[in-house]
């Protein structure tokens, strides 16, 4: 364990600094110049520095569980847990799940009524009794309901020609109902005859494109619990189709741009506002289904199995079954899917703030263990065989009191977890004894809390009418700085810098702003080590023979000397044996400046006065052209040809010398003077 602390001045701040931090409440534990923060350290460090074990404050996270035996069947226990969380330290508790036999089931059958499902509808009309019988084999309390869907009633999802809207079926003789997004036909009931009667009245419909509006329908089934009649029991949603599904974004094809709002919009048992809202996204639907404990069973034809298997990867607690082309095997399919769903248990929690982290260790009955997962997960769970999940909850800071819920997905049982902060230090109450604080304050965890008008480690400083802000002001570099740079105590308006436990570190300066260690490093040592330089207030002072911001360079200029042994050709300075050239000049020796403007135009008047003693500088040539030296012999360099003050062409060569704007100039004897017109 370690304790990384920053500006700690109370036991609470210490505990907040991390799980390895503990606080010593022993009196006079700090010496003169010691900061209060040295009371905050790891337990071994405090013990080593002479703090008795019973003076060390180290509150720990803990969990208290409560069982609630009121009410019927409970598959999850405990029902309530209270956690006291210290920042950074997990509290752990166990949750047991025992799968109950005969748990009540609500099953809602949601069917695609597009034309290709005609033969399926015939079979489903006869299904009521079989479905309830199958449910009653599993549970003593089963109910069934029915709904159907086609798609949004705008192009390109359906044909909007008036005739086609009245009868969308390809066969005109066939009695066929107009297309619709979702119709809630039968509220959940245990009356199989009613199922038969209501489903018997349903007519097939039709649409235009292959994917259907099934996600729209599922969203309404999840968002309208009162209308559907869901009880607080296992909720199954059988989704029967032979095709794919539209999802968020597809609405744009029909100029529907408003995102799906996840709310119930049933009027007269119809989703009448489907042409106002886009289809839901898969994630949005998954969230809604989980929130309402609904477990979808996708009963789909063979060519669609792969598609819907992909969907079940995103929707937790969902299953896929292969539906025969005429839906004749649907009862068998539902039984299998239910067994698969109810034998897999996911333990999860509702959304939490970033300050809380929850992980699960799953100890499954088949000997399989999953550790540190974002949710609990056990497969092959058998009736009445308990499985255990260890839940670990960690707070990253001192949290507000709050609670969250853990649930087994698809089941109605919940565990309510109340979370409280464990940040206070219950130090021995010495508030009666004021003598240690000069009678001007009381002790709190070994530190004086001074009365108004007094400040200082032992309340020894009277503010004398000056506000503590004023006194503290003279301990700040400026208004934005912290008192004594956070490295000293402000005693009566003066900084008393802390002693450091870091070897070789001395804190000093009017505001404790300086030290002998926070400088650049070279070879892992401050200022390259004591042999190269010393650290003074953030800057290295190098010993003779060394240079550089971390004294990393031996003071030599060999790499900066040009062939005439001029440092950086007089056009830069040598730092760490490398030239820093003036603007535009190039490394290594600042010899060339490819981007600099041509000097020709600049020196025409100098060429004129130096050679011919004419032109604007004729009278004071040497003062006007100090960097130029006339050569009697031709030189190598830049060749120039410019017009002089008399309009004559003058040819000259400039050979750059060391330094800035210094040239050797050779000017041709003859000028080209073109006579003007007569």
């Amino acid at each position: 364990q370690e304790c990384t602390k920053f500006k700690v001045s109370s036991c609470r701040e210490c505990i907040e600094s991390g799980p390895g931090c503990t606080w010593c409440q022993k009196l006079n534990f700090t010496g003169p110049g010691d900061p209060d923060s040295i009371r905050c350290d790891t337990r071994p460090q405090l013990l080593m520095r002479g703090c008795a074990a019973d003076d060390i404050m180290d509150p720990t996270s803990l969990a208290e569980t409560q069982e609630d035996h009121n009410g019927g069947q409970k598959q999850l226990s405990p029902q309530k847990v209270t956690l006291y969380l210290r920042p950074g330290q997990a509290a752990a508790f166990n949750v047991t799940f025992r799968r109950a036999k005969g748990y009540p089931i609500d099953l809602y059958y949601l069917m695609d009524l597009s034309y290709s499902m005609l033969d399926d509808l015939r079979n489903v009309k006869k299904l009521g009794g079989d479905l309830l019988r199958a449910l009653n084999e599993i549970t003593e309390s089963g109910r069934i309901g029915f709904g159907s869907f086609v798609d949004k009633t705008v192009l390109p999802f359906v044909n909007t020609h008036p005739d086609k809207l009245r009868n969308p079926c390809p066969n005109k003789e066939k009695e066929c109902q107009p297309p619709f997004a979702f119709r809630h036909v039968l509220k959940l009931t245990n009356n199989s005859n009613q199922f038969q009667t209501e489903v018997g009245k349903q007519l097939i419909s039709g649409n235009l494109d292959a994917p259907e509006g099934g996600l729209d329908a599922m969203m309404q089934v999840a968002a309208c619990p009162e209308e559907i009649g869901w009880r607080n029991v296992t909720r199954l949603l059988v989704f029967a189709t032979d095709d794919g599904f539209h999802f968020a974004g597809d609405g744009k094809l029909g100029a529907i741009l408003t995102p799906n709002d996840g709310r119930c919009h049933l009027e007269d048992n119809l989703y009448k506002r489907s042409n106002e809202f886009d289809y839901p996204s898969v994630g949005q639907l998954a969230h809604k289904l989980a929130e309402n404990n609904i477990q979808p069973i996708f009963a789909v034809t063979s060519r669609m199995v792969k598609t819907y298997e992909k969907l079940t990867e995103i929707i937790p607690k969902s299953a896929v079954g292969e539906l025969s082309e005429d839906s004749s095997n649907v009862v068998h399919l539902i039984k299998n899917a239910y067994n698969k769903l109810s034998s897999r248990v996911f333990l999860d929690h509702n959304a939490l703030p970033d300050t809380l982290k929850v992980t699960y260790d799953s100890f499954c009955s088949n000997g399989v263990t999953h550790r540190n997962q974002p949710r609990g997960d056990c497969d092959g769970v058998q009736i009445n065989v308990p499985i255990t999940f260890q839940v670990k909850v960690t707070a990253t800071e001192c949290i507000q009191e709050q609670s969250f819920v853990i649930r087994a997905l698809g089941f109605t049982d919940i565990v309510t977890v109340q979370v409280l902060p464990q940040c206070e230090c219950r130090c021995r109450d010495q508030s009666r004894d004021r003598s240690l604080c000069h009678g001007k304050g009381f002790l709190e965890c070994g530190i004086c809390r001074c009365d108004t008008g007094y400040i200082g480690k032992n309340c020894e400083c009277q503010t004398q009418g000056r506000s503590s802000q004023e006194l503290e002001g003279s301990c700040r570099k400026d208004n934005n700085s912290i008192i004594c740079s956070g490295l000293g105590d402000c005693v009566c308006g003066q900084c008393l810098c802390h002693t450091s436990d870091v070897p070789g570190k001395l804190i000093y300066g009017q505001y404790c702003e300086c030290d002998t260690i926070n400088c650049e490093r070279y070879n892992g040592q401050v200022c390259g080590g004591p042999g190269r330089g010393l650290c003074f207030c953030g800057k290295c002072r190098c010993h003779p023979g060394f240079e550089g911001s971390a004294c990393q360079c031996e003071r030599t200029t060999e790499g900066c000397l040009n062939p005439r042994r001029v440092e950086c050709s007089g056009r830069g300075r040598c730092r760490c044996n490398v030239c820093e050239c003036h603007s535009g000049y190039q490394l290594p020796l600042c010899q060339e400046c490819p981007g600099c403007p041509s000097p020709c135009g600049k020196y025409i008047s100098c060429a004129e006065c130096l050679k011919f003693e004419k032109g604007p500088f004729g009278k004071n040539c040497s003062a006007a052209c100090p960097g130029l030296q006339l050569s009697n012999n031709p030189v190598k360099g830049r060749t120039c040809k410019e017009r002089d003050s008399e309009g004559c062409w003058v040819a000259y060569t400039l050979e750059q010398q060391d330094g800035m704007d210094r040239y050797l100039i050779y000017v041709d004897e003859s000028r080209e003077c073109v006579a003007g017109p007569n």
């Epitope: 490398v578 190039q586 490394l587 290594p588 020796l589 010899q591 060339e592």
Partner: nanobody, 117 residues
């Protein structure tokens, strides 16, 4: 990493000529300036001549008029030494530079030039 290999050094009579060559390999694409240094026994190393990729040349006072530096491609540089004198006796080293960091830190093995009187 840059490697430099110097060649052409030998024993020559005063007044004679020699042509030194240096071939660079490795990160040659970034070279802008190449130069010849020399170090006589018991003396400091000194820069004799440099040539840039644009052809700009620069000479020490002792080399001016007698030595010519040339470059036949990005990574080969020559030093033509005429009218050699005994004081030109030294180990001659080649060096290369980039625009970004200045001289490469490494040195080649050097080539020995001895001028006898």
């Amino acid at each position: 990493e840059m490697q430099l290999v110097e060649s052409g050094g030998e024993l020559v009579q005063a007044g004679g000529s020699l042509r030194l060559s240096c071939a660079a390999s490795g990160s040659v694409s970034s070279i802008n300036v190449m130069g010849w240094y020399r170090q006589a026994p018991g003396k400091q190393r000194e820069l004799v001549a440099t040539i840039s990729s644009s052809g700009y040349t620069d000479y020490s006072d002792s080399a001016k008029g007698r030595f010519t530096i040339s470059r036949d491609n990005k990574n080969t540089v020559h030093l033509q030494m005429n009218s050699l004198k005994p004081e030109d006796t030294a180990v001659y080293y080649c060096r290369a530079s980039t625009l970004r960091t200045g001289w490469f830190t490494g040195w080649g093995q050097g080539t020995q030039v001895t001028v006898s009187s």
